[in-house]
């Protein structure tokens, strides 16, 4: 025998003490699938959460968070204080990253500089606290007749010849 | 912790009526379905009804003698119980839940209860 409630749709709930007919949801609740016998309270986005996406009768709302927040956890459980570049957000709130490391990101950890000598490379551009370091060719590379490369001749003035 | 306190049992005679009252703390009920479950003295627990936005959906047994209602300003749900019986007698518990009805669910958290003894 096929179960009744198998027959309700979604948005609808399948009501056991009326001979299961199949009852609306009311509003602000949903049943995403066919043949439930309950309907699922929507979420409400509130005070740091905002609505991304209206609750209907057959799903749920979706929240974000408010500009200064960002989402954390799975369908943004959580809402996050966002910090500046350069910062990380701490039990006392967002602190500057210390010296040898860097954040680009208004959410996450500060982390370390690359070690370009562990890559056998030199340090062509400095670390800041937003930027990491940037590595450039090994020192044996920049060494004199290393090279194999030509380097382009001087470029001369016009109107002027060669003395 | 959420934390539900019923009150307003009481003794009352067949025929006569009682609010029973479930306040909650710890949290709002906003985002909740609110019900009612009772179980008399020996006896399974029966589902009384359900209240969510504007909604209510009530057990099998009643037949239009109760009634769920809810004051969001004092974050309280009320039970309105007329034409009382005998068979009413038993424990009542307040309980909420994220599902409507909660006819066929575990509720999420339940008061300790509030006794209705119906007697002459």
């Known amino acids: 025998l096929q179960d009744p409630c198998s027959n309700c749709p979604a948005g609808t709930f399948c009501d056991n003490n009326r001979n299961q007919i199949c009852s609306p949801c009311p509003p602000n609740s949903f049943s995403s699938a066919g043949g439930q016998r309950t309907c699922d309270i929507c979420r409400q986005c509130k005070g740091v959460f905002r609505t991304r996406k209206e609750c209907s009768s057959t799903s749920n709302a979706e929240c974000d968070c408010t500009p200064g927040f960002h989402c954390l956890g799975a369908g943004c459980s959580m809402c996050e204080q966002d910090c500046k570049q350069g910062q990380e957000l701490t039990k006392k709130g967002c602190k500057d990253c210390c010296f040898g490391t860097f954040n680009d990101q208004k959410r996450g950890i500060c982390r370390p500089w690359t070690n370009c000598s562990l890559d056998g490379k030199s340090v062509l551009v400095n670390g800041t606290k937003e930027r990491d370091v940037v590595c450039g060719p090994s020192p044996a590379d920049l060494s004199p007749g290393a090279s194999s490369v030509t380097p382009p001749a001087p470029a001369r003035e016009p109107g002027h010849s060669p003395q | 912790e959420v934390q539900l306190l019923e009150s307003g049992g009481g003794l009352v005679q067949p025929g006569g009526s009682l609010r029973l009252s479930c306040a909650a703390s710890?949290?709002?009920?906003?985002?909740?379905?609110v019900g009612w479950f009772r179980q008399a003295p020996g006896k399974e627990r029966q589902y009384v009804g359900t209240y969510w936005s504007g909604y209510a959906h009530y057990g099998d047994f009643e037949n239009n003698r109760f009634t769920i209602s809810r004051d969001n300003s004092k974050n309280t749900v009320y039970l309105q119980m007329n034409s009382l019986r005998a068979e009413d007698t038993a424990v009542y518990y307040c309980?909420?839940?994220?599902?409507?009805?909660?006819?066929?669910?575990?509720?999420?958290?339940q008061g300790q209860g509030t006794l209705v003894t119906v007697s002459s």
């Open positions: 309980a909420i839940s994220l599902k409507y009805p909660m006819a066929t669910v575990t509720p999420d958290y």
């Open positions: 710890g949290r709002t009920f906003d985002n909740y379905a």
